[in-house]
């Protein structure tokens, strides 16, 4: 039969510049001699010759002199070769293939990888900076493969996704210098962090910056939003109120207005330098520019949608700067339940029923409450599932397993907890006249 | 190091449009604003507008609204400026600078005759 | 357009003595003002930003000073390559606007 050949299972990794093993190993029989064994070491791809042993001898490296077998190990299996210096061009798979009497092959994949370097980030523009201003954030490391992974994040660890570009480019070792850049809007403060994964090593490297724009002396704005959620039906427009007390003499020139979502800092709209820079949020925002003078910065958010909710900062800037957050919280009523009943005929006491009440189409998700005809709970024997569709809208479908009585009506309520609206129905059920005895 | 480089000077005909060209290097070009400034000789600096090269918004002094038309081509971190309908009055030096409130680097400036 | 309005329009110093000039605009500014030096046949340079913070790498004889809308650039110990005209912009308002200048000379 043929010549059992094993190799890890696992690709090999090496870093760039250090020395790898890629091992290989046969069981040699009783009374072998290495005038036996013929091993081949190959490019699996190309069938490159790289390293080989015949009639007795080390035929040496084919691999440009980086290429070392194991003599003392041979006798004992031990085929494994070591390959020196390692470089980015040597990943791939290489086949270690032993001949003696019978012959047998198998590949061992090499993933080569270097660290990157710690990022430097620079911030431009990077003197008088102002809330409301749009700065660039690089964040640059060097000499890494393979090609890293690239994340963003503000001071509370929040992912920043939006407006963010990353190249990578490959020098002649082939090796990687990657090149972050994040354009993001000034808030009062903030950290921006940058961090480098190297998916091979597992390895993060990461770098902050912390930008304070400049305050004016005269103080701060005092920015105004309501403490409770703004609750809008989906589909529906909705304000998010926020005001400031503009001092006398105030013009329009002088207001930077930013709204942003407060976790990921994307822009949603924004008015600076006398005019309004339109909606950033798929078009469905708008200000209300006559009131803007007197104060009224709040934000029109047309025909709602679930993936709206949320928190959004009013930003304002004048001489200098205030915010303030506003939670929006969506709603969508849910419909009158359907109630089903199954088995639906030839009902009687004693019977086990599945009663099953669906509504649909609302958010958040409901509360959904069972009872029977005299109001008494029932809460044994209930499952409810909810499911989101697209749009994120649940419809909710609850079963209740209920034995049957002589008569019995049952309830299903569906709460929506926002809008603190109860959607209800029921089903009255009239069992059979009874049989004495019972038929089985 | 950053530079903005412009050329040294235009000779064009009354009536004539112009393109002037700013070359941006030394620094991330779509990071900052680029703005553009008249000088007449022995006279004071006029802004004429700035444009921001990561999305060409633009801004202008409404005295250059009909005058000026500022572009960017990114690929070669170049910002331009087209003057139309020429008259001697526009004979002037223009700069490049790039920033939003300050001007921290500002190109040599060419130098516009209009003259038949 | 916010009107800037520099004096003098022109004046003469001594090595070593301490020159004044004054930008005034014409509404409130807060503090959002620079002062450039441009000497003969170059290009304008920043020396000053937000009132009183010195561009890297100006000497330090220079300063400024004033919010709202009385401003004022010193030089201190006046040198001969301090020849120059020096002027005000405000970065508070759109459209920007600068004064019309102080021409330096060395006496």
């Known amino acids: 039969g043929a010549l059992e050949v094993q190799v890890p299972e696992d690709p090999v990794v090496a870093l760039v510049g250090t020395d790898a093993t890629l091992c290989c190993s046969f069981s040699p029989e009783p009374g072998f001699s290495l005038a036996q064994l013929n091993l081949i070491w190959q490019l699996t791809d190309t069938k490159q010759l790289v390293h080989s042993f015949a009639e007795g001898q080390d035929q040496g490296s084919a691999y440009a002199n980086r290429t070392a077998l194991f003599p003392d190990l041979l006798a004992q299996g031990n085929a494994s070769l070591r390959l020196q210096r390692v470089r980015v061009a040597d990943e791939g798979s290489f086949t270690c293939f032993v001949s003696i009497r019978d012959f047998g092959s198998a590949a061992v994949s090499l993933q080569v990888a270097a660290p990157y370097s710690k990022p430097s980030m620079t911030l431009e523009p990077n003197k008088d900076l102002r809330p409301g201003d749009t700065v660039t954030i690089t964040c640059s490391s060097y000499q890494g493969y393979p090609e890293a992974e690239v994340f963003w994040q503000d001071g509370q660890g929040v992912p920043l996704t939006g407006n963010v570009t990353t190249s990578q480019m490959a020098n002649e070792q082939g090796l990687f210098d990657v090149h972050s850049i994040l354009r993001v809007v000034l808030g009062a403060n903030g950290t921006y962090s940058c961090l480098v994964r190297n998916p091979v090593l597992q390895q993060d490297a990461h770098s902050s910056v912390t930008i304070t724009p400049q305050r004016s002396p005269t103080g701060a704005v005092e920015v105004q939003v309501p403490e409770d959620p703004v609750v809008a039906l989906v589909g529906t427009d909705a304000t998010l109120r926020c005001s400031f007390s503009p001092e006398p003499g105030f013009s329009l020139a002088q207001l930077n207005l930013i709204w942003q979502l407060t976790d990921t800092k994307q822009l949603v709209h924004s008015f600076t330098e006398g005019r309004d820079q339109g909606s950033a949020y798929a078009n469905r925002t708008a200000l209300f520019p006559d009131l803007l003078a007197q104060g009224n910065a709040s934000l029109r958010l047309q025909r709602v949608r679930v993936a709206d909710e949320g928190s959004f900062t009013c930003f304002v800037s004048i001489r200098d700067f205030g915010s303030a957050a506003v939670s929006l919280q969506v709603a969508a009523p849910y419909s009158k339940p359907s109630m089903t009943l199954e088995p639906n005929k030839d009902l009687r006491p004693g019977d086990t029923v599945t009663i099953t009440c669906s509504s649909y189409r609302g958010y958040p998700e409901a509360e959904v409450f069972w009872q029977d005809g005299q109001g008494v709970p029932l809460t044994g024997n209930v499952t409810t599932s909810q499911m989101a569709n697209e749009q994120g809208l649940f419809d909710v479908h609850s079963v209740l397993r209920v034995v049957l009585g002589a008569n019995g009506t049952y309830s299903c309520l569906v709460r929506n907890p926002v809008l603190q609206q109860d959607a209800h129905g029921s089903v009255t059920i009239t069992g059979q006249p009874m049989t004495f005895p019972p038929e089985a | 190091q950053v530079q903005l480089q412009q050329p040294g000077a235009e000779l064009v005909r009354p009536g004539a449009s112009v393109k002037l060209s700013c070359k941006a290097s030394g620094y991330t070009f779509t990071a900052y604003w680029m703005n553009w400034v008249k000088q007449r000789p022995d006279q004071g600096l006029e802004w004429i507008g700035r444009i921001d090269p990561y999305d060409s918004e633009t801004r202008y002094n409404q005295n250059f609204r009909d005058k000026a038309r500022l572009t960017v081509d990114k690929s070669s971190s170049t910002a331009y400026m087209q003057l139309s309908s020429l008259t001697s009055e526009d004979s002037a030096v223009f700069y490049c600078?790039?920033?939003?409130?300050?001007?921290?680097?500002w190109g040599q400036g060419t130098t516009l005759t209009v003259s038949s | 357009d916010i009107q800037m309005t520099q004096s003098p329009a022109s004046l003469a110093a001594s090595v070593g003595e301490t020159v004044t000039i004054t930008c005034r605009t014409s509404?409130?500014?807060?503090?959002?003002l620079a002062w450039y030096q441009q000497k003969p046949g170059k290009s304008p340079q920043l020396l000053i930003y937000n009132a009183n913070t010195l561009e890297d790498g100006v000497p330090s004889r220079f300063s400024g000073s004033g919010s709202g809308t009385l401003f004022s650039l010193k030089i201190n110990n006046m040198q001969p390559e301090d020849t120059a005209t020096y002027f005000c912009k405000q970065a508070y308002d759109v459209p920007r606007t600068f004064g019309g200048g102080t021409k330096l000379e060395i006496k």
């Open positions: 509404e409130n500014i807060d503090y959002t």
């Open positions: 600078a790039r920033g939003v409130r300050i001007f921290d680097y």
